[in-house]
């Protein structure tokens, strides 16, 4: 009675294919012959187990790394199969916006590119999707803009997709950086005041960074001194009637505002007494 | 009635610092921005410091940036002038002002006098 | 920046009119200017703000004999009916903002002499 190690090892996939990622996959270890018998079968990279119903190994929720798997079967002896790859498929893995041009703070005006980036993929044809707000803007891998605009800013996101499924990007927030515009004197409480009271004059605008320095200005284009966004006359006289503007200015550059004109009108006692 | 009250000047070493004071009273202070201005022993006026109601702007001439720092505690309704490395030149009588409404200084302190000299 | 320029001083025989001169420099002659009064041994006193139309907003307690007036790059003091406590020098001043760093100037001041 010659005793030998199982002959003709040989590991079996009993799914389908293809295997997705998640699936649960069924392996058989086979053999042709053995003596004495087998008493137990190890799995790599999976471990031992003793009891020979073990032959079969179920593989829960595979993942996209399982990539080989070996079984042995063992009598007095192991002997092992070569290897199977499960070439398990999956959806795009780690996808993320990424800058790639300007290097440094984007600025109105500037061309941006911006490139979606994943790690792996299989199967490795991919189409991908570019969307800001809920609304598809491209394609293509590369999202460009040949002139950025403040309106341009805002979350971006890329999807990436392949035959198994789609996987998107953390939002990125595109950040715009430029000069104050739309600048405007508001006047409260109205543009109308009496001698004697208080009038706020208001510089409104829009800048990414903010306003860091304001400066006022009366219709000869004289600065006042003052370098607030509000500036309060309190009381305010009938001599101080005209128009007035201002200039904000941030890292970027400055902007203006249109004239604003106030206007200071004499109290019934002033009146009274000419 | 307002009221601008410098104090803290006197005799200092070239080289040396000094901080002069002003306190207001008859008015908001908080809401005012302030000036000090000096005045020469040639009687010339001299705009030497500006700071904003809240204190967050300040402005120097060049003949004092670096070397003059202006403040303010609008709690204590006042106004600080810290002085170094003072020369010569820096002699004069120190006038606190407050700022009018659009263009102008409307109302001057007494003064307090700084002599650089060794 | 701006720059003011003044006689250096004037004399007026008493219960005349005076009219003193602050003249701005070419580039700014639209700019609103600062009148101030320096009595022998005092501080200065705001006067009157002066606008280049001629309006103008006078200070606390300053008679009406003064009054202001403008041409051009020109802006004037006048005192009418001139007192002994007129006797001071006047001072003009203006201020501006260039590169983002405001600045305030004054012109040299006249010296205003009462006689009789």
């Known amino acids: 009675d010659v005793q030998y190690p199982p002959k003709k090892v040989t590991t079996v996939i009993q799914n389908p294919m293809p295997i997705r990622e998640g699936d649960t996959v069924t392996l058989s270890c086979n053999y042709n012959s053995s003596n004495p018998s087998v008493t137990r079968y190890e799995w790599k990279p999976h471990g031992a187990w003793e009891e020979p119903s073990l032959g079969v190994l179920k593989i829960q929720n595979v993942g996209w790394d399982n990539t080989t798997i070996a079984c042995a079967a063992c009598n007095s002896w192991c002997s092992w199969a070569s290897p199977v790859a499960l070439n398990v498929q999956y959806a795009p893995r780690d996808v993320r916006v990424r800058k790639i041009k300007p290097l440094s703070e984007i600025h109105s005006g500037n061309s941006v590119s911006l490139q979606c980036d994943f790690s792996s993929s299989h199967p490795k044809e991919v189409q991908f999707f570019w969307e800001k707000n809920g609304r598809l803007l491209g394609k293509e891998s590369q999202l460009n803009f040949d002139s950025i605009s403040p309106e341009d800013a805002g979350s971006y996101s890329c999807w990436v997709n392949n035959s198994i499924g789609q996987t998107a990007s953390k939002a990125w927030t595109l950040e715009v950086l430029y000069a104050p515009r739309r600048l405007r004197v508001s006047m409260s409480p109205g543009d109308q005041v009496m001698e004697g009271k208080s009038a706020t004059l208001t510089c409104e605008s829009d800048a990414n960074p903010p306003v860091s320095h304001y400066t006022w200005f009366d219709w000869n284009n004289q600065s006042l001194p003052y370098h607030s966004q509000k500036l309060r006359l309190e009381p305010v006289k009938v001599q101080h009637s005209g128009a007035y503007w201002c200039q904000g200015t941030n890292s970027v550059g400055k902007g203006r505002s249109p004239l604003s004109t106030l206007t200071v009108y004499y109290s019934p006692e002033t009146i009274g007494r000419r | 009635e307002v009221k601008l009250v410098e104090s803290g000047g006197g005799l200092v070493l070239p080289g040396g610092s000094l901080k002069i004071s002003c306190a207001a009273s008859?008015?908001?202070?908080?809401?005012?921005?302030m000036y000090w201005i000096r005045q020469t022993p040639d009687k010339r006026l001299e705009w030497v410091a500006y700071?904003?109601?809240?204190?967050?702007?300040?402005f120097y001439p060049d003949s004092v940036k670096g070397r003059f720092t202006v403040s303010r505690d609008n709690a204590k309704n006042t106004l600080y002038l810290q002085m170094s490395r003072l020369q010569s030149e820096d002699t004069a009588m120190y006038y606190c002002?407050?700022?009018?409404?659009?263009?102008?200084?409307?109302?001057w302190g007494q003064g307090t006098s700084v002599t650089v000299s060794s | 920046q701006p720059v003011l320029t003044q006689s250096s001083s004037a004399s007026f025989s008493l219960g005349a009119s005076a009219k003193l001169t602050c003249t701005l420099s070419s580039q700014y002659s639209t700019y609103t200017i600062g009148w101030y009064q320096q009595q022998p041994l005092k501080p200065p006193k705001y006067v009157m703000e002066?606008?280049?139309?001629?309006?103008?907003h006078t200070g606390d307690g300053i008679p009406d004999r003064f009054s202001g007036s403008s041409s051009g790059a020109d802006r004037y003091l006048s005192i009418s009916n001139i007192q002994p406590e007129d006797e001071a020098t006047y001072i003009c001043?203006?201020?501006?903002?260039?590169?983002?760093?405001?600045?305030?100037?004054f012109g040299g001041g006249t010296k205003v002499t009462v006689l009789g």
């Open positions: 700071i904003s109601n809240t204190g967050y702007s300040t």
């Open positions: 002002a407050r700022h009018g409404i659009l263009y102008a200084m409307d109302y």
């Open positions: 001043g203006v201020g501006d903002t260039i590169k983002e760093q405001f600045m305030y100037v």
């Open positions: 002066l606008k280049h139309d001629g309006s103008r």
């Open positions: 008859g008015f908001t202070f908080s809401d005012y921005y």
